[in-house]
Interface confidence: low
């Protein structure tokens, strides 16, 4: 074992390091003392060290780790940070486009639903991305009530355009028969099916990405333990004590004393590791009708072959809806 | 024949000019994010070493220092953290997680199982065809220019695939970088059935 | 112009593996899938699997998995393709293709590889 | 998987002439569907996709028709260079499959 050496006789480099930590010289001795009021850095002989210096070492030891943690978290933690709201732009950008290309298909294919089309659609598409920031909205509904309030316009306007202006009374009806009589035949299920499908997995995509971040934020704001900030003392500065200025902790000793501060923060890993492999398999599965960007661009094309199905059944539907509003009609027409 | 807007599209003379090469989806994105995420998969496990590694630790000194003395760097003391009689590394280790990282493992847990859950294929339709349900997905009328994907996947895309990332705000990648690209020449005003199935596995 | 540039004819022994490559070139490589197709002499077309090479990834027609590795190195633009446990039913001609847009259209293909598997 | 099946196997016809390849899926694959000519000894030419949308540089003799399972080729005014065999293919999703081809030869 190599003999210790000679103290600092005059403590004059701790005294010259000390004071980078902490400006005023008050706390740091003269001369090497006995230090037996130190609680970490326990001499083996005469130290330079005070009990006013060993806390400062210690609360500047877990600030050096809250740091290094931070450091260490640093990329990953923009990355996920950055995604996410990539992401939740991009995905409003989705619904701004499919919003766009549906107002387009009325306007280019059926002008005489606009402007309440317009509005039944918007509604439609601010509910989307209600959905998908973690409203409590329900998809079916949602679907339910844009085909509801398009069959009264489709049928005033498209299929009987004779009608008088819709009054509340056949519009309640035409709702009603909406569902009743499958006036879209499957669309609106084909199209809840792929709408419900590709948000739940959009929506908790994002709610991943967002945990992912809190995740991070939890682990580099944690407050070390007294025993660790000891530890950490022990390691990094009580070698100063003896006015051993340029010596580092060995390698070994460091892993065993991160993993002592760090035993808390280790026990996420297995989370962590089954967190990106679900997202991961989350991910592979985003595709066809779990794909939002696919579904909701679609969405315009396959109102509009719903609204052909309609017409394509319209002298069927006009016949039998004539029977079942026959009461509202007529007192419209009074 | 349905009549759609020129407005849908990217201008034919623009097509001509198009960098087809910097087209960017939302699906090669997300892989992307998975693949880098990836990466970090060890990140709290590695974190002790991390730290170790970025702090100074004696590397090529032939002296380093073991908490309480100076010792030879490969000496059976230099592993040793000399606290005798100070406090207990191991109770320190049985203490067990915060309640901050107690609760956040919870979070953890439960988006795992979310996560899992949406990914399961049983608790999927993919192959579950709507035809069966009543759709009537004979052929698309006579004059129509597109299709719909009747078992629920097969969905149009219009010709000019949107390159949502390049109107984000945000500096990603070079490689990323998006930009003007062509999904086909669109002939006369037609839709096509011609879409995203590039993530499709 | 696009081009999809693939290695020479390939003769291998029963039981070896071989890697087959495909150079592109005229776009860029990251953007679009690269697929594999199979042909055997006189028969139909087969596709065995695609490559993105922005992110590495390959996805495998199912009675390929095992036998097709895909590969994609962006630094060279270059897709490859290894087969293993090589058959006298490898024997074929191996083109690659590159998606036209996002999905399994094909407008553009390698002039293919003939490999021959014989001892 | 998705089935293609096409006839006929082959087919001999004269320059001039007007020939039609069918092509039918094993199930409904709506419009998403693609023609390829293959030469002796080359590699396959993009000639339709979407069932009806002919590849650039495709001459107008070619043109695609159908739609679910029931799908066409016409080739009218048959030229020198059209002779080769003719493939469809889905492109409706995983794995995308080929048909079984249909030769067209010089009468």
């Known amino acids: 074992q190599p003999p210790p050496p000679p103290p600092d006789a005059t403590c004059h480099q701790v005294r010259s390091f000390f004071q980078r930590l902490q400006p005023g010289l008050k706390w740091v001795p003269e001369t090497p003392v006995p230090g037996s009021d130190l609680q970490v850095c326990l001499p083996k002989g005469p130290t330079c060290c005070s009990r006013k210096m060993e806390e400062k070492y210690q609360l500047t030891a877990r600030l050096n780790m809250e740091q290094l943690l931070q450091s260490a978290s640093m990329e990953l933690k923009f990355l996920i940070i950055q995604n996410a709201a990539v992401f939740q732009e991009a995905f409003e950008i989705v619904v701004r486009h499919a919003k766009n290309y549906t107002n387009a298909m009325f306007k280019n294919n059926y002008p005489s639903l606009t402007p309440q089309a317009f509005e039944f659609v918007g509604e439609f598409f601010t509910d989307v991305s209600l959905y998908i920031l973690g409203s409590d909205i329900n998809v079916d509904d949602m679907v339910n009530e844009l085909f509801d309030s398009l069959f009264p316009v489709i049928y005033t306007q498209l299929m009987n355009p004779g009608l008088p202006d819709s009054a509340l009374d056949i519009n309640e009806c035409l709702r009603g028969a909406r569902r009743d009589l499958k006036v879209f035949g499957n669309f609106p299920k084909l199209i809840m099916t792929q709408v419900s499908k590709s948000l739940q997995v959009t929506r908790i995509f994002l709610q991943a990405l967002n945990l992912g971040i809190e995740v991070i934020n939890t682990t580099d704001h944690l407050k070390f333990s007294k025993d660790c900030g000891r530890m950490l003392t022990r390691m990094w500065y009580c070698s100063y004590c003896q006015g051993l200025m340029m010596v580092k902790p060995c390698g070994g000793y460091c892993n065993v004393v991160m993993q002592g501060c760090m035993a808390g923060v280790v026990e996420i890993d297995k989370y962590w590791r089954e967190y990106i492999l679900s997202l991961e398999e989350l991910v592979n599965g985003m595709y066809r009708i779990y794909d939002m960007e696919n579904v909701l661009l679609g969405l315009f094309s396959t109102i509009h072959d719903s609204i052909q199905y309609v017409q394509k059944n319209a002298g069927k539907l006009t016949t039998t809806i004539g029977k079942l509003c026959a009461h509202s009609q007529q007192r419209q027409y009074r | 024949s349905a009549y759609y807007p020129e407005d849908l599209f990217i201008d034919k003379k623009v097509l001509k000019v198009a960098h087809v090469e910097h087209e960017e989806t939302l699906s090669s994105r997300r892989r992307e994010l998975i693949q880098k995420l990836k990466s970090f998969i060890s990140f709290y496990s590695a974190l002790p070493g991390y730290i170790c590694s970025h702090s100074p630790v004696a590397e090529n000194d032939t002296l380093c220092w073991n908490g309480q003395e100076l010792v030879e760097r490969y000496s059976q003391k230099a592993a040793r953290n000399g606290m005798k009689n100070q406090f207990n590394l191991h109770e320190l280790k049985m203490k067990g997680p915060e309640p901050v990282v107690s609760q956040i493992i919870d979070k953890l847990k439960h988006i795992n199982q979310l996560l899992r859950t949406m990914s399961m294929p049983k608790g999927r339709v993919l192959d579950k065809n709507l035809d069966e349900e009543g759709f009537e997905s004979g052929d698309c009328g006579d004059d129509e220019d597109e299709c719909i994907g009747g078992s629920g996947d097969g969905m149009i895309k219009v010709k000019n695939q949107l390159r949502f990332l390049a109107e984000l705000a945000y500096d990603l990648d070079v490689d990323d970088a998006p930009g003007n690209s062509q999904q086909a020449t669109p002939k006369d005003n037609e839709i096509s059935t011609f879409h995203n199935l590039g993530n499709v596995h | 112009q696009v081009q999809l540039q693939q290695s020479g004819t390939d003769l291998a022994r029963p039981g070896a593996s071989v890697k087959l490559s495909c150079k592109a070139s005229?776009?860029?490589?990251?953007?679009?899938?690269i697929s594999w197709v199979k042909q055997r002499t006189g028969q139909g077309l087969e596709w065995i699997g695609e490559?993105?090479?922005?992110?590495?990834?390959?996805y495998y027609n199912e009675k390929f998995t095992g036998k097709a590795t895909l590969t994609a190195d962006k630094s060279s633009s270059t897709a490859y393709m290894e087969l293993r446990s090589l058959t006298s039913e490898d024997s074929a001609v191996y083109f690659c293709?590159?998606?036209?847009?996002?999905?399994?259209?094909?407008?553009?293909w390698g002039q293919g590889t003939a490999l021959t598997v014989s001892s | 998987d998705i089935q293609m099946t096409q006839s006929p196997a082959s087919l001999s016809a004269s320059v001039g002439e007007t020939v039609t390849i069918t092509c039918r899926a094993s199930?409904?694959?709506?419009?998403?569907l693609t023609w390829y000519q293959q030469k002796q000894g080359k590699s396959p030419q993009l000639l339709v996709y979407?069932?009806?949308t002919l590849a650039e540089g495709v001459p107008s003799r070619f043109s695609g028709s159908g739609s679910g399972t029931q799908f066409s080729l016409k080739i009218n005014s048959l030229q020198p260079e059209d002779f080769g065999t003719y493939y469809c293919?889905?492109?409706?999703?995983?794995?995308?499959?080929f048909g079984t081809g249909t030769k067209l030869d010089l009468k």
């Open positions: 979407n069932a009806k």
């Open positions: 199930e409904n694959i709506y419009s998403y």
């Open positions: 005229g776009y860029t490589f990251t953007s679009f899938g």
């Open positions: 293919q889905h492109h409706y999703g995983t794995p995308p499959t």
């Open positions: 490559i993105y090479p922005r992110s590495g990834s390959p």
């Open positions: 293709a590159k998606d036209f847009g996002s999905s399994y259209v094909f407008d553009y």
